[in-house]
């Protein structure tokens, strides 16, 4: 029968080594064996590349493209094939559908004035144009309440989100991810980080214990529990 | 060492053919695009073709378009142009020269980075 | 296509002197920051060419550090600080981004 494509493809990049574009068929495809995703910069002497699809549902395929650092200029011609038959033929220019890296290394470590440092890393080198356009987005959940959640902006430059122990419940358990976005490109949101989880050790004030000794244990406390959630 | 030497160069009638042929060493040819530029006695320098490393890509001035073809065999390490339909204008010094890197998603740029010594094409009844 | 225009089509200058050729193009040929593709050539009669600039500033090998490229967008210019005896020849500017490529006139530089 004849191969038809239901969704054509839509395609995002990470501005600095990868372009992934995913599509639907109309019915359940071997994607790697039947189409071939070619694409060749739209640049004097260019030549024209091939992407071997893979599977990520039954009539889902993805083709993931190696590309050079992107520029503003670069468009992509994309042609999708099914043998000798042209199923799909389109245009795509990275820096109009960026998608950033997700965040790397997310931690969570006890600080002073009694808060919880939160700090991942930036997924782009110093050089990249990305590095310094991310802004991000931090989830902080309860992992036993799902209606106890909050979510902070970060607009600054840093990494990094402090958060005040007297916000989260005392002896609950939460977990954070991060995920990030580039304005100026008005991209779309990264995936979210793996998440990392961390017990919230936090007495009130009238219990009048010294929350610095608090602090100091939960210290170890964390150590041990965060030891145990990366090894299990 | 790079070195590239252009032969085939003659004294053709008009309306005839010639096919010009530019050997390469000293470097790996099938990475880099190839370019054809000339120069008529007492003139500058005009650019002809280019064809990309593979060979899958090919430029034309509109001077030549549809009488010259630009073609290449990575296994000799030649580069090719064949010239149809000549006229008198066409006389001049043709150079073959090394042009961008297309091993790369988007090529590497140095200019014409190595040129050949050039050979003649004279046409003339 | 594009012209490329290169003043002046003549220069002399003198031994240690400063030249300076400029070239303008119809179209620009900043593809994007840091690339700007234009080249510098010069050529001594009865040789072939040679690459000098190329991406608008950047030396090709084996050239000396008296000559350098400056410009962005559609004008460029070539610099030879300290002119020499064997500077002397014709200087093509080129433009590598859009097809069909194109050379400049030609700048016949004399030393007095």
């Known amino acids: 029968g004849s191969v038809k494509v239901l969704h054509e493809p839509s395609c995002f990049s990470d501005y600095i080594s990868t372009s992934v574009c995913q599509w639907k068929m109309d019915h359940p495809t071997n994607c790697s064996a039947e189409l071939r995703l070619s694409y060749q910069l739209d640049f004097m002497g260019s030549e024209n590349h091939t992407c071997v699809p893979e599977n990520r549902e039954d009539s889902v395929c993805v083709c993931s493209m190696p590309i050079d650092d992107a520029v503003e200029a670069d468009v992509y011609q994309l042609d999708l094939w099914a043998g000798q038959q042209l199923l799909w033929s389109g245009s795509f220019q990275p820096s109009k559908h960026v998608k950033p890296r997700t965040p790397g290394n997310l931690t969570v470590h006890p600080n002073i004035s009694h808060t919880w440092l939160l700090m991942w890393t930036n997924p782009y080198p110093t050089e990249n144009h990305l590095h310094s356009e991310l802004t991000y987005m931090v989830n902080v959940s309860n992992d036993n309440d799902p209606e106890d959640f909050k979510v902070y902006n970060v607009t600054y430059m840093g990494p990094t989100l402090r958060l005040a122990a007297s916000t989260l419940k005392s002896g609950a358990s939460y977990s954070a991810r991060v995920r990030a976005w580039a304005q100026t490109y008005n991209s779309t949101w990264s995936d979210w980080s793996p998440s990392t989880t961390w017990l919230n050790y936090y007495e009130p004030w009238e219990q009048h214990l010294g929350l610095n000794d608090i602090f100091e244990a939960q210290k170890i406390e964390w150590h041990e529990h965060h030891h145990h959630h990366h090894h299990h | 060492e790079v070195q590239l030497v252009e032969s085939g160069g003659d004294l053709v009638k008009p309306g005839g053919s010639l096919r010009l042929s530019c050997v390469a060493s000293?470097?790996?040819?099938?990475?880099?695009?190839m370019t054809w530029v000339r120069q008529a006695p007492g003139k500058g320098l005009q650019w002809l073709s280019l064809i990309s490393g593979s060979g899958g890509k090919t430029y034309y001035a509109d001077a030549v378009k549809g009488r010259f073809t630009i073609s290449r065999d990575n296994a000799k390490n030649t580069l090719y142009l064949q010239m149809n339909s000549l006229r008198a204008e066409d006389t001049a010094v043709y150079y073959c020269a090394v042009d961008r890197l297309t091993k790369t998603i988007r090529p590497q740029y140095y200019g014409l980075w190595h040129w050949g010594q050039g050979t003649l094409v004279t046409v003339s009844s | 296509d594009i012209v490329m225009t290169q003043t002046p089509l003549s220069l002399s200058v003198s031994p240690g002197e400063t030249a300076s050729i400029s070239c303008r193009s119809s179209k620009s040929l900043t593809y994007s920051i840091g690339y700007n593709y234009l080249d510098w050539y010069m050529q001594k009669p009865g040789q072939s060419p040679q690459g000098l600039i190329y991406?608008?500033?950047k030396r090709a090998s084996g050239v000396s550090d008296r000559f350098s490229g400056s410009g962005s967008g559609a004008d460029f210019t070539l610099k030879i600080s300290r002119v020499e005896a064997d500077d002397a020849g014709v200087y093509y500017c080129m433009q590598g981004l859009h097809s069909p490529l194109g050379f400049g006139q030609g700048t016949k530089l004399e030393i007095k």
């Open positions: 000293g470097f790996t040819f099938r990475d880099y695009a």
């Open positions: 991406l608008g500033s």
